[in-house]
Interface confidence: low
Amino acid sequence: RTVAAPSVFIFPPSDEQLKSGTASVVCLLNNFYPREAKVQWKVDNALQSGNSQESVTEQDSKDSTYSLSSTLTLSKADYEKHKVYACEVTHQGLSSPVTKSFNRGEC
């Protein structure tokens, strides 16, 4: 099948999760092909490494595309120290990386 660029979404942690003392920020990539995609996390423009996990779905039976979720996990205290959370996605269907972001407290 032909190259399909991912649709990218970012989700802040829920209030319920924050009450438990942790914060998970999720970057979701939907309906892309081929499977190779790269997600980089930036917090206040600083590149993060080692504190994220990725999960890729198998090919969708209808259109042979993939989806991927990358979860950045922080303590509530660390999460509240910073303002801008961003995931940067690179994929061969994108002419340049796509960045989705939010400002903590404004979403």
Epitope: H91, Q92, S96
Partner: nanobody, 121 residues
């Protein structure tokens, strides 16, 4: 309509270099993103590198990073791929492609015919 014509392929020994060119005609060249893809025998076409409109941002595949350099000359309507430290696994037909969408979304509407690169060990 955009026409793309690649050149510069050939046979080179491992460790050598080649410079591919892709000449474009038909639209305002500086306004669209240009990419290189390649296809090895029996394999899918894969992304190599892209340079965004104007000539600023570039992005490379993991296999091209550090060895290949994409550049463009808007005055000559040409995009280049400088390939250094070539390996046998770089053997493929190399294609240039143009994304003419306003937001450079990665929809490569126009493709060249390709140029063969063969790297011998």
């Amino acid at each position: 309509q955009v026409q793309l014509q690649e050149s510069g392929g050939g046979l080179v020994q491992a460790g050598g270099s080649l410079r591919l060119s892709c000449a474009a005609s038909g639209r305002t060249f500086r306004n669209y993103a240009m990419a290189w893809f390649r296809q090895a025998p029996g394999k899918e076409r894969e992304f190599v590198a892209v340079i965004r409109r104007g000539g600023g941002d570039t992005y490379y595949s993991d296999s091209a990073e550090g060895r290949f350099t994409i550049s463009r000359d808007n005055a000559k309507n040409t995009v280049y791929l400088q390939m250094n430290n070539l390996k046998p696994e770089d053997t493929a037909v190399y294609y240039c492609a143009a994304d003419v969408s306003d937001d450079n979304t990665g929809k490569y509407d126009y493709w060249g015919q390709g140029t063969q690169v063969t790297v011998s060990s």
